[in-house]
């Protein structure tokens, strides 16, 4: 008789990434009998919640329920009803909420309280809402990309799943850029670390990994821009800020109260003789780059080598996956190709930043002006962070792979987080069975 496939026992999981600028809901699925295999979990849906990050709801917490409705209803549609009760839901908040907690633990808890109340109204199995640490964000991002790239798999393949996958088991480093923080995580060549705060030890699938990680709070692209503006307005002679990081002809009024709202600008805060100032773009990459470099304190390092601000950074090792805003920005600028050298990227950025604002608006008519206006800064910031902050060079630039998705799953911390919380990454290598017993009869 012919082999007949049995209906597969599929499991689902939901993770909400409550970032500083927005919230995204991810739905994952996997075959139940292969829970401990590597690479079997994949993303089936991403739903971007309309509106800003949850930390912005601190004065209107009653709106959080409505804010989450569309994406939670989407999850209800995507996941079969019979699976709803069994489906775990996790919410992890990142640097936007870390910043809010720095200002007021009570306010941060109030937001999370309302999040739990809202999510408990759905038929899923809500597991918890919390602010994840920067270390976790880095570590889970590293786990995600290496899981998806098959780096934890003991089976060597003669083929590659993705273009930049090499058949060796060397893990990729992870570079994550958000709105309010950025993370760098990799396995350094030297096992011993000068800074225990930046050291993580994992045992995954029977192998030990000694991982370096650091999260730079306030160095996500949005907070870095606020920092730069707060720094530059200090020396402005009047309420006009001629800014090289914005296109020529671009104008925008900024409230000083908004500028000093975030803890990230506290170090630059001063009493100004005006309540508002106007940014006037002059579109000069080189000057923008110089201004950005002033955000990185490289004069002090209590270790053999530092990134910036006195934070230990071992010598870079191996290939890196750069995802989240690293990818979104570079993809918009059409600079994600493996063939584009660092020199070429710099050249393209010079050209892009110098383009008049009116011309840019016409060329990218479908893009929201708020986002469009910031790509010159963001691209420049990415280059500065990678080259001067993390010490990539023109040569090692080719080891950076700008990644959006790997085999249909977004690169980011959420998958690694769910794999960990559902105990789907075993410490030991599972015993392989020749045939999964429940697949065929």
């Amino acid at each position: 008789t012919q082999n007949k496939a049995l209906p597969e026992n599929i499991k689902y999981g939901i993770v909400l990434d409550a970032g500083s600028s927005h919230t995204s809901l991810y739905i994952y699925k996997w075959p139940a009998e292969k829970e401990n295999d590597t690479g079997v979990v994949h993303q089936v849906e991403e739903c971007r919640v309309k509106g800003p990050g949850i930390s912005k709801y601190v004065q209107k917490v009653n709106e959080i329920g409505i804010y989450l409705t569309d994406c939670m209803e989407r999850a209800r549609e995507v996941i079969p009803r019979s699976q709803h009760q069994e489906t775990p839901v996790y919410l992890g908040a990142t640097a936007g909420m870390r910043l809010l907690r720095m200002e007021s633990e009570e306010l941060a808890d109030r937001v999370l309280d309302v999040v739990e109340r809202s999510l408990s109204n759905y038929p899923f199995d809500f597991q918890g809402a919390r602010i994840i640490t920067g270390q976790e964000e880095g570590a889970y991002g590293w786990i995600t990309i290496n899981y998806l790239l098959g780096k934890f798999s003991q089976k060597t393949r003669w083929f590659s799943i993705v273009p930049y996958e090499t058949n060796n088991q060397e893990t990729f480093g992870a570079l994550d850029l958000g709105g309010a923080s950025t993370q760098i995580t990799f396995v350094p060549q030297n096992q011993t670390t000068e800074s225990p705060d930046n050291a993580l030890q994992f045992r995954l699938y029977g192998k030990d990994y000694n991982v370096y990680t650091h999260s730079f709070l306030c160095y996500g692209k949005d907070q870095a821009l606020w920092q730069k503006l707060a720094k530059d307005i200090q020396v402005a002679s009047n309420e006009i800020l001629r800014d090289p990081c914005f296109h020529p002809g671009y104008k925008k009024v900024v409230n000083v109260s908004d500028l000093y709202k975030t803890p990230c600008t506290k170090r630059f805060e001063m009493t100004l003789p005006f309540q508002q100032f106007e940014i006037q773009g002059i579109g000069n990459y080189q000057q923008c780059h110089q201004s950005v470099l002033e955000l990185f304190n490289t004069s002090y390092c209590p270790y053999s080598q530092c990134a910036f601000n006195g934070i230990f950074l071992p010598p870079l090792q191996g290939d890196f996956g750069a995802f989240s805003a690293f990818y979104f920005v570079m993809n918009f600028l059409n600079l994600t190709s493996e063939k584009v050298s660092q020199e070429k990227v710099t050249e393209m950025m010079k050209k892009f930043c110098s383009q008049p604002w009116e011309e840019i608006k016409t060329s990218y008519a479908g893009v929201k002006e708020k986002y469009l206006s910031e790509y010159c800064f963001s691209g420049t910031y990415i280059l500065s962070l990678l080259l001067q902050g993390y010490h990539f060079t023109a040569d090692s630039w080719e080891h950076i792979h700008f990644i959006g998705k790997i085999q249909g799953s977004d690169a980011g911390w959420t998958l690694g987080y769910m794999l960990n919380l559902t105990n789907m990454i075993p410490a030991e290598q599972p015993l392989s069975t020749p045939l999964s017993h429940s697949t065929y009869v």
Epitope: Y90, L112, E116, R117, D125, A129
Partner: nanobody, 126 residues
């Protein structure tokens, strides 16, 4: 790792009330679902009730529904179990339990990694 300390146990007459408390040290309290389990002599440890990190989700064993109430005070890192209309069959050692990023429903199934308190004796006399 969180540490749990129960208090409030004792001897009470049938029909009476008792309030147990469990204080948690270390860890971020709101990240833990909290629960109460009980173990009568010669019996297995049984689920009584559990509550989510911010208190919006609760589960109760059928045997205590309507008589027992679980609550939590996140500012005080404490979970409470108010026991009313106590019966002799409620006599047991009551254990406080904490489970990180685990739903009350999973606690009920004793799934996930659970941290236990030392237990407090509750005796209901007839």
């Amino acid at each position: 790792q969180v540490q749990l300390q129960e208090s409030g146990g004792g001897l009470v007459q049938a029909g009476g009330s008792l309030r147990l408390a469990c204080t948690v040290s270390r860890g971020t309290f709101s990240e833990y679902s909290m629960g109460w389990f009980r173990q009568a002599p010669g019996q297995e440890r049984d689920f009584v009730t559990a509550i989510s990190g911010f208190g919006h989700i609760t589960h109760y064993a059928d045997s205590v529904k309507g008589r027992f109430t679980i609550s939590r005070d996140n500012a005080a890192n404490t979970v409470y179990l108010q026991m009313n209309t106590l019966k002799p069959e409620d006599t047991a050692v009551y254990y406080c339990a904490a489970a990180w990023q685990t739903s009350p429903r999973r606690m009920m199934q004793m799934a996930g990694s659970i941290t236990w308190g030392q237990g407090t004796q509750v005796t209901v006399s007839s």
